[in-house]
């Protein structure tokens, strides 16, 4: 390594290396200064003169110490289903993420390339797994004693109210209707309270209810990309 007082450009010691903010210029055979984030090499170094750096032009950037002759172009503007979470500056690329109610179906190094709308569970089905930034909602049929009467990407199956006298029994898509006296709520098996989705967003694995194997029992079988599964509405 060079003595700490070596000024660029300088010839490294035999077998030595340049410092971290320097690069070895093959033509000059010297250790030369890199340019900081937000700049690029306007003039490369020679044996007697160091690198000359210049600011990146509008809509271009460099994020690292570099010796590139031109700055990188910022990505295109965010699409209508996205929000710009980081603006294009001289030191960083634009970052687009999916807006609420959407998730990232195809990500890129930073941000999202393709957003898709979160699946909505139709009446009789509730959210088994909420959507995240990179995964879609998973729906499940409401278990006996629970219901969902909404088309929603956030609502879970809720327990039927318990009646002293039942006017209309509840089913998977409708609450029980009681007569006269005030009802109470049960905590029926399978009524799992899920948190709200982190945000929205990923792979289309659609759960499909399997054929019933026993009264009140159902399984969720993840399958590959397919038309919207039972219990979900199209995007």
């Amino acid at each position: 390594l060079p003595a700490q007082v070596a000024f660029t450009p300088y010839a490294p010691e035999p077998g030595g290396t340049c410092r971290l903010r320097e690069y070895y210029d093959q033509t000059a055979q010297m250790c030369c200064s890199k340019c900081p984030p937000g700049q690029h090499a306007k003039v490369f170094c020679t044996k007697t003169s160091d690198t000359v750096c210049d600011s990146c032009e509008d809509s271009t950037y460099t994020q690292l110490w570099n010796w590139v002759p031109e700055c990188l172009s910022c990505g295109s503007r965010c699409s209508s289903d996205q929000v710009e979470t980081q603006a294009c500056t001289r030191e960083q690329n634009r970052i687009c993420t999916c807006r609420p109610g959407w998730y990232c179906a195809l990500s890129k190094q930073e941000g999202c390339r393709l957003c898709a709308q979160l699946r909505k569970c139709r009446p009789g089905f509730g959210v088994a797994r909420p959507g995240t930034e990179t995964s879609d909602v998973v729906c499940k049929p409401c278990a006996p004693g629970t219901f969902s009467n909404t088309t929603s990407s956030t609502d879970i199956c809720r327990p039927h109210q318990i009646c002293h006298v039942v006017a209309i029994p509840g089913n998977a898509s409708m609450d029980a209707v009681c007569t006269s006296t005030s009802p109470t709520r049960s905590m029926a098996p399978g009524a799992v309270h899920l948190p709200q989705p982190v945000s929205t967003r990923s792979q289309h694995t659609q759960p499909t209810p399997a054929p019933s194997t026993a009264p009140g029992t159902s399984f969720l079988l993840p399958v590959g990309p397919s038309p919207p599964a039972e219990g979900s509405t199209g995007d």
Partner: antibody
Framework: QSVEESGGRLVTPGTPLTLTCTVS????????ISWVRQAPGKGLEWIGI?????NTAYATWAKGRFSISRTSTTVDLKITSPATKDTATYFC???????????????WGQGTLVTVSS | AYDMTQTPATVEVAVGGTVTINCQAS??????LAWYQQKPGQRPKLLIY???DLASGVPSRFSGSGSGTEYTLTITGVECADAATYYC????????????FGGGTEVVVK
Amino acid sequence: QSVEESGGRLVTPGTPLTLTCTVSGFSLSSNAISWVRQAPGKGLEWIGIINTYDNTAYATWAKGRFSISRTSTTVDLKITSPATKDTATYFCARDVHNNVVPYYFDMWGQGTLVTVSS
Amino acid sequence: AYDMTQTPATVEVAVGGTVTINCQASQSISNLLAWYQQKPGQRPKLLIYDTSDLASGVPSRFSGSGSGTEYTLTITGVECADAATYYCQQGYSSSNIDNVFGGGTEVVVK
């Protein structure tokens, strides 16, 4: 080889003051120079930097309050409108590179004391 | 911003002991970190640059390590002469920077 600061004195608030960093034993043609200050009993605080192309960069809090300029042998720091909070020892330091991002400082002056008081 | 947070503010160590000082950057600074030693009434002195490279004349009991956002200065076999305040300094960016230096760590030798 050395760098030396001068110009520190007692000033009243609002009176502009210019400090000078003079180098000897080396040329200012290949190195950036930073100004750093240290309030009594406090830590080091970077103010700003100038390179041989007269490009400058400043700490966010220093923009508009300080300006750095240079000649072939000196680097000046102007405190545009000193306040009592600017009371400190002011150092100039030689950078090993010639960029407006400080790399590291291999040479420091002894410092010059600025006292701002009414 | 690349804010530098140094811990601890003060550390006591016996002669012959080992002391570790930490410096954390708010974003990755790609090993562009230097350490300085300053004794009361004196100018700062460069100890280490590029995270781990010793400046000339600096004893080998001083060493530096780290990467990304976390960096460490270690003094092994502490001597009385090591009583001082130590500062880290990032060399990655000067855009929207409050200070390139950490807040400092005072090393008290018992």
